[in-house]
Interface confidence: medium
């Protein structure tokens, strides 16, 4: 069947990196500069992606594969194949329409990208706050207040113990 198909369609013999040139009796012609074909039997070559502006070339275009871009320092990739670059912010910030803004009280972001997320509510799991949250870090939940009461099970209370939600002075 493959033999028959290739007799019927000479273009099927054209390998990746070439195209079937209708202007030249369907000869397999190499892809022109700055273009590629990643599969055989193609009638045209695709234009290579250009990594310009905020984009850097991670992988050069070849006759058989497209260029790949990543982002210049201070930016990170978004979207399939790094179709967009988004500005980094500092930890403890999020990107808004007005640029990088500090996380509101009660929220944190431990990365250079993404949004500020609320601190964990320890009490929902019956636990207490062991370490207070900051703009950059979530709270750390510890044993429940009951576990810290005298005569409770063998959980060793943290030293020094302090009221949930309050920083040591």
């Amino acid at each position: 069947f493959e033999r028959t198909r290739s007799l019927q369609d000479p273009c099927s013999n054209c390998p990746a990196g070439t195209f079937c040139d209708n202007n030249r009796n369907q000869i397999c012609s190499p892809c022109p500069p700055n273009s590629f074909s990643s599969a055989g039997g193609q009638r045209t070559c695709d234009i290579c992606r250009q990594c310009k502006g905020v984009f850097r070339t991670r992988k050069e275009c070849s006759s058989t594969s497209n260029a790949e871009c990543d982002c210049t320092p201070g930016f990170h990739c978004l979207g399939a194949g790094c179709s967009m670059c988004e500005q980094d912010c500092k930890q403890g910030q999020e990107l808004t329409k007005k640029g990088c803004k500090d996380c509101c009280f009660g929220t944190f972001n431990d990365q250079k990208r993404g949004i500020c997320r609320p601190w964990t509510n320890c009490s929902l799991d019956g636990k207490s706050v062991l370490v207070n949250g900051t703009k950059e870090r979530d709270v750390v939940c510890g044993p429940s207040p009951a576990d810290l009461s005298p005569g409770a099970s063998s959980v060793t209370p943290p030293a020094p113990a302090r009221e949930p939600g309050h920083s040591p002075q």
Epitope: F55, C69, E86, Q87, T96
Partner: nanobody, 122 residues
Framework: EVQLVESGGGLVKPGGSLRLSCTAS????????MSWFRQAPGKGLEWVSH????????DYADSVKGRFTISRDNAKNSLYLQMNSLRADDTAVYYC???????????????WGQGTLVTVSS
């Protein structure tokens, strides 16, 4: 096809001024935030400023705050950067960029101009 064309660059003495322009075509200019970026010789790309679609929200990098002013004329599909009190470290290729409509702060890879060179030297 989206096109962004910068102009207005050139050689200027320290303390001097320049006004960069960016003319946009191929998209509805009024729908998009727009940004200026710059790239100094041998350095990475640096965000300079951006402006919201209506021009009401504006932000600047600390390095240019108080010296540069971004503006836009939606009737002319144009973005501007007025640069005053120029210093040697402002020397760079300046690019305008269209920010992604879904999340300002992002830039789609084909939505960049080719840049205009600003050289600040005595």
């Amino acid at each position: 096809e989206v096109q962004l064309v910068e102009s207005g660059g050139g050689l200027v003495k320290p303390g001097g001024s320049l006004r960069l322009s960016c003319t946009a075509s191929g998209f509805t200019f009024t729908d998009y935030y727009m940004s200026w970026f710059r790239q100094a010789p041998g350095k990475g790309l640096e965000w300079v400023s951006h402006i919201s679609s209506s021009g009401t929200t504006i932000d600047y990098a600390d390095s240019v705050k108080g010296r540069f002013t971004i503006s836009r004329d939606n009737a002319k599909n144009s973005l501007y950067l007025q640069m005053n009190s120029l210093r040697a470290d402002d020397t760079a290729v300046y690019y305008c960029a269209r920010e992604d409509i879904r999340m300002p702060g992002t830039t789609d890879f084909d939505n960049w101009g080719q840049g205009t060179l600003v050289t600040v030297s005595s």
